[in-house]
C-alpha cells in the first residue's frame, strides 16, 4: 500500500517541500506531482506466488517500506 | 514491464538513426522512459528521456541532434538522432528508472546500430 | 556533469574470493538524505542489471553476497564471495541529477 503524503526537505532545497496526499515529490522537476505520474512501486497481489521482474526495486533494512514498497526515508517524509 | 527496442540496424553517415521503443505492463504517461547507448567495448553513455508529461532532457553532449517522442496510444517512444557519424555506432537501450530513486531497474535487450556507407 | 571513477579497471580474483569495487564522484551524489549511487551487472551481449540501488539496496532477486556501501562521492560495491556468474563488467551510475552519468567500469575476471 501506497503511503499517503511525502515531500522531500534537505541541505539542497531552500525551503520544506510538502507534498500533499496522493501527491509524490518528483526530484526530476523538483516539485509535487501526482504519485499516479511517477513509476511507484505496486503492492503485490495478496497470494502471488510468480516471481518478481527482473530487477524491481525491493525495500531493504535501512528504507522504511511497506510490503511492496520502497519509501523515502527523508528527513521531510511529513 | 517489458521495453523492447526496433529499428533499423545499419544507417548511412549523415543520416538520421531512428529507433523505437515499444513498452508493454505499463503506461508511458507515467514515469521517466529514457535512452542509453553503449559504445562498442564501451562503456554506457545517458542520451535522455521523455517524461510522463511528454516533457524531454537530452544530455547536452548530443542535445543538437537528439529528439525523443512519443506515441502514447501504442505506448511507445522514439529517439531519433541526426547527422550519424560511424561515432554513433553503438548498442541502443531503452530503460525506465523507479520512483523514488531514479534507479534503470527496466532495460531493453538492446538493438545494435551500425554506422556506414 | 557529476564524473564517475571506477577503480580498478580490472579485478583478476578466483571465484569463492572477495570482490571490493570503488567509485568515486566528483561531487556528492546525496540529497534529501539519501545517496543516489546505483550499481549494475553488465554480461557480454545483455543489457545492464540493477543489483544495488541508493547506495546500499539491493534490487530483486539480488543475492545477499552483494552489498553496497558508501556516502557522499565515496562508494563501494562488495561480492562476499565469488561465484562462477559474477564474473562480469560492473558499473556505478548516479541518479542525483541528469544528465544521468556512469562510471567506467570494472572488469571482474577470472584469475
Known amino acids: 500500500m501506497r503511503r499517503g503524503p511525502r515531500s522531500l526537505r534537505g541541505r539542497d532545497a531552500p525551503a520544506p517541500t510538502p507534498c500533499v496526499p496522493a501527491e509524490c515529490f518528483d526530484l526530476l522537476v523538483r516539485h509535487c506531482v501526482a504519485c499516479g505520474l511517477l513509476r511507484t512501486p505496486r503492492p503485490k497481489p495478496a497470494g502471488a506466488s510468480s516471481p518478481a521482474p527482473r530487477t524491481a526495486l525491493q525495500p531493504q533494512e535501512s528504507v522504511g517500506a511497506g510490503a511492496g514498497e520502497a519509501a523515502l526515508p527523508l528527513p521531510g517524509l511529513l | 514491464v517489458q521495453l523492447q527496442e526496433s529499428g533499423p540496424g545499419l544507417v548511412k553517415p549523415s543520416q538520421t538513426l531512428s529507433l523505437t521503443c515499444t513498452v508493454s505492463?505499463?503506461?508511458?504517461?507515467?514515469?521517466?522512459w529514457n535512452w542509453i547507448r553503449q559504445h562498442p567495448g564501451k562503456g554506457l553513455e545517458y542520451i535522455g528521456y521523455?517524461?510522463?508529461?511528454?516533457?524531454?532532457y537530452y544530455n547536452p553532449s548530443l542535445k543538437s541532434r537528439v529528439t525523443i517522442s512519443r506515441d502514447t496510444s501504442k505506448n511507445q517512444y522514439s529517439l531519433k538522432l541526426s547527422s550519424v557519424t560511424a561515432a554513433d555506432t553503438a548498442v541502443y537501450y531503452c530503460?525506465?528508472?523507479?520512483?523514488?530513486?531514479?534507479?534503470?531497474?527496466?532495460w531493453g535487450q538492446g538493438t545494435l546500430v551500425t554506422v556506414s556507407s | 556533469d557529476i564524473v564517475l571513477t571506477q577503480s580498478p579497471a580490472t579485478l583478476s580474483l578466483s571465484p569463492g574470493e572477495r570482490a571490493t569495487l570503488s567509485c568515486r564522484a566528483s561531487?556528492?551524489?546525496?540529497?534529501?538524505?539519501?545517496?543516489?549511487m546505483n550499481w549494475f551487472q553488465q554480461k557480454p551481449g545483455q543489457a545492464p542489471r540493477l543489483l544495488i540501488y541508493?547506495?546500499?539496496n539491493r534490487a530483486t532477486g539480488i543475492p545477499a553476497r552483494f552489498s553496497g556501501s558508501g556516502s557522499g562521492t565515496d562508494f563501494t560495491l562488495t561480492i562476499s564471495s565469488l561465484e562462477p556468474e559474477d564474473f562480469a563488467v560492473y558499473y556505478c551510475?548516479?541518479?542525483?541529477?541528469?544528465?544521468?552519468?556512469f562510471g567506467g567500469g570494472t572488469k571482474v575476471e577470472i584469475k
Open positions: 530503460a525506465s528508472p523507479n520512483y523514488p530513486f531514479y534507479a534503470m531497474d527496466y
Open positions: 505492463g505499463d503506461s508511458i504517461t507515467s514515469g521517466y
Open positions: 521523455i517524461s510522463y508529461s511528454g516533457s524531454t
Open positions: 561531487e556528492s551524489v546525496d540529497n534529501y538524505g539519501i545517496s543516489f
Open positions: 541508493a547506495a546500499s
Open positions: 551510475q548516479q541518479s542525483k541529477e541528469v544528465p544521468w552519468t
